[in-house]
């Protein structure tokens, strides 16, 4: 009598997640009587996938009509495939008994699942950094298979090179994750800049997934300060202007000090945006010169985005004869920034 053969014609089958997988198996003979079972994996830890004899396997169906005894096709179809279904499947013939006796196994069919990566999520630094500093952005994508994947970083369309990328796990797995970190050098012009993490995978059919982050969330552009005096008015009042320019974000508090005493505090709000995304703000202070015997030291103090205050001071000279206007009153800019202000073009 011819020896029973269990034939699994495909060594491997690749299926997209969510689709159905057909695993083919035929036997050369129906003798002896006994069930066919499908297992994932081999050895004592193998997992029963389908038993034509009995059991409830909601995702698995026999491809051919199992009520036809002369049917030697024991192929199965597994629906709604997920990465967790990956593995090698064996079609095994048993002889009926107590227990059933394993007679012959097919060579096995390796099922690989093509699973799309999740949409890349890009996260930036927890705190803002100023121009000329380097910040790190992280991109993560999960759940893809097979392991081969390409990740690229772009800033305003230009590919970044200071990148470190890892795919986990290193060994075989049902699905994989990628994590990449890009280091980006900030400039004052980066308020409107964007970094893009682009992921390409076989499941995406040439249409990569992208995750983005705006550098506006990561950058702080400190303001330039300039204090100037307009000409003396007829009513002995001097108009002093504090110009705060090229800053980002908008969160800014300006305080006027007269001889060290707080005169007025203002908060920036609803400012128009410059083309480069930064903001400008001008504050005026009217100083009544006739109310002062001595020179007045005016200080424009700016606190930007929770950072230490920046001061710019200005002295208004008060003459012994205040009624004589014009040349008798001098203005002197004695202010200095108490921290470095980075220059840049707007």
């Amino acid at each position: 009598e011819e020896e029973l053969q269990v034939i699994q014609p495909e060594k491997s089958v690749s299926v997209a997640a969510g689709d159905s997988a057909t695993l083919n198996c035929t036997v050369s003979s129906l003798i002896p009587v006994g069930p066919i079972q499908w297992f994932r994996g081999a050895g004592p830890g193998r997992e029963l996938i389908y038993n034509l004899k009995e059991g409830h396997f909601p995702r698995v169906t026999a491809v051919s009509d199992p009520t036809k005894r002369n049917n030697m096709d024991f192929s199965i179809r597994i629906s709604n495939i997920t990465p967790a279904d990956a593995g090698t499947y064996y079609c095994v013939k048993f002889r009926k008994g107590s227990p059933d006796v394993e007679l012959k196994s097919g060579a096995g069919t390796e099922l690989s699942v093509r699973a799309k990566p999740s949409a890349p999520v890009v996260s930036g630094p927890a705190v803002r950094a100023t121009a000329e500093h380097t910040v790190s952005f992280t991109c993560e994508s999960h759940g893809f298979s097979p392991r081969d994947i390409t990740l690229k970083w772009f800033k305003n369309g230009n590919e970044l090179s200071d990148v470190q990328t890892n795919v986990d796990p290193a060994g075989k797995s049902v699905s994989y994750s990628i994590r990449s970190t890009a280091r980006v050098l900030l400039t004052r012009r980066d308020v409107h800049s964007q970094v893009i993490c682009e992921v390409a995978h076989v499941t995406l059919q040439g249409d990569p997934l992208r995750g983005t982050a705006n550098l506006s969330e990561a950058i702080r552009v400190p303001p330039f300060l300039e204090v100037t005096q307009q000409s003396m008015r007829a009513d002995n009042q001097v108009n002093v202007t504090c110009q705060v320019t090229k800053f980002y974000p908008q969160r800014l508090q300006l305080t006027w000090l007269e001889n060290g005493n707080v005169s007025r505090t203002e908060m920036a709000s609803a400012l128009p945006e410059n083309k480069d995304g930064t903001y400008n703000w001008t504050s005026w202070l009217l100083v009544n010169v006739s109310a002062h015997r001595d020179d007045v030291k005016l200080t424009c103090q700016v606190e930007h985005d929770g950072q230490p205050a920046v001061n710019k001071s200005f002295s208004v000279k008060v003459s012994a004869h205040p009624k004589e206007q014009g040349s008798n009153t001098a203005a002197e800019n004695t202010g200095t920034n108490e921290r470095n202000i980075y220059g840049g073009s707007g």
Epitope: E1, L30, I31, V33, G34, P35, I36, L52, K53, E54, P66, T67, K68, R69, N70, K96, G97, S98, P99, D100
Partner: antibody, heavy 118, light 107 residues
Framework: EVQLVESGGGLVQPGGSLRLSCAAS????????MHWVRQAPGKGLEWVSA???????YYTGSVKGRFTISRENAKNSLYLQMNSLRAADTAVYYC????????????WGQGTMVTVSS | DIQMTQSPSSLSASVGDRVTITCRAS??????LAWFQQKPGKAPKSLIY???SLHSGVPSKFSGSGSGTDFTLTISSLQPEDFATYYC?????????FGQGTKLEIK
């Protein structure tokens, strides 16, 4: 429609012979293990004999050497040749199809009565 | 030979009742156990195979369970047409053997 129809039953004297037939329709009889089961009047069911798809045959102890199971593929029919009949063989004889993969009985004929009496 | 013992031999019940019939094998038969229903003057009807699988067309009020040596047939809500004799059968090895039957009668 899948169907089994038995014939050939009747009254026979002890020591006599009888040949039961089972005509199958709606399926290919040679693709299934086929069985004969009997039921004596007022008694329970008793498996008698089987023939496998490879032609292998099996019998219950009390009929071994007296009964012969066979089939004729061309006629899609199953037979039970009964010799040296005894009163204890009196029963309704059912032709039964063995089910898929494991030979569980799934289709029964309506039965044919065999009476062994002098 | 493997002996099959059914209990009880007879059982009286009312329409709507839930009844359980047990079958014990003299040795391990895996789950190669079938249940049949027979009405007077009729051929047996196959209900259950491999201990718990319902044959096509059999209503779900019939259920089977067990493995090894101890098995049960449960009818969840008796209807008039369910009053009959029920047989279990092992078919793990020849000679196939039946239980002696359980006659289910109307109370």
């Amino acid at each position: 429609e899948v169907q089994l129809v038995e014939s050939g039953g009747g009254l026979v004297q002890p020591g006599g012979s009888l040949r039961l037939s089972c005509a199958a329709s709606g399926f290919t009889l040679s693709s299934y293990d086929m069985h004969w089961v009997r039921q004596a009047p007022g008694k329970g069911l008793e498996w008698v004999s089987a023939i496998g798809t490879a032609g292998d045959t099996y019998y219950t102890g009390s009929v071994k050497g007296r009964f012969t199971i066979s089939r004729e593929n061309a006629k899609n029919s199953l037979y039970l040749q009964m010799n040296s009949l005894r009163a204890a063989d009196t029963a309704v004889y059912y032709c039964v199809r063995g089910g898929v993969w494991d030979d569980a009985f799934d289709i029964w004929g309506q039965g044919t009565m065999v009476t062994v009496s002098s | 030979d493997i002996q099959m013992t059914q209990s009880p031999s007879s059982l009286s019940a009312s329409v709507g009742d839930r009844v359980t019939i047990t079958c014990r094998a003299s040795q391990d038969i895996n789950n190669y156990l079938a249940w049949f229903q027979q009405k007077p003057g009729k051929a047996p009807k196959s209900l259950i195979y491999t201990a718990s699988s319902l044959h096509s067309g059999v209503p779900s009020k019939f259920s089977g369970s067990g493995s090894g040596t101890d098995f049960t047939l449960t009818i969840s809500s008796l209807q008039p047409e369910d009053f009959a004799t029920y047989y279990c059968q092992q078919y793990v090895s020849y000679p196939y053997t039946f239980g002696q039957g359980t006659k289910l009668e109307i109370k």
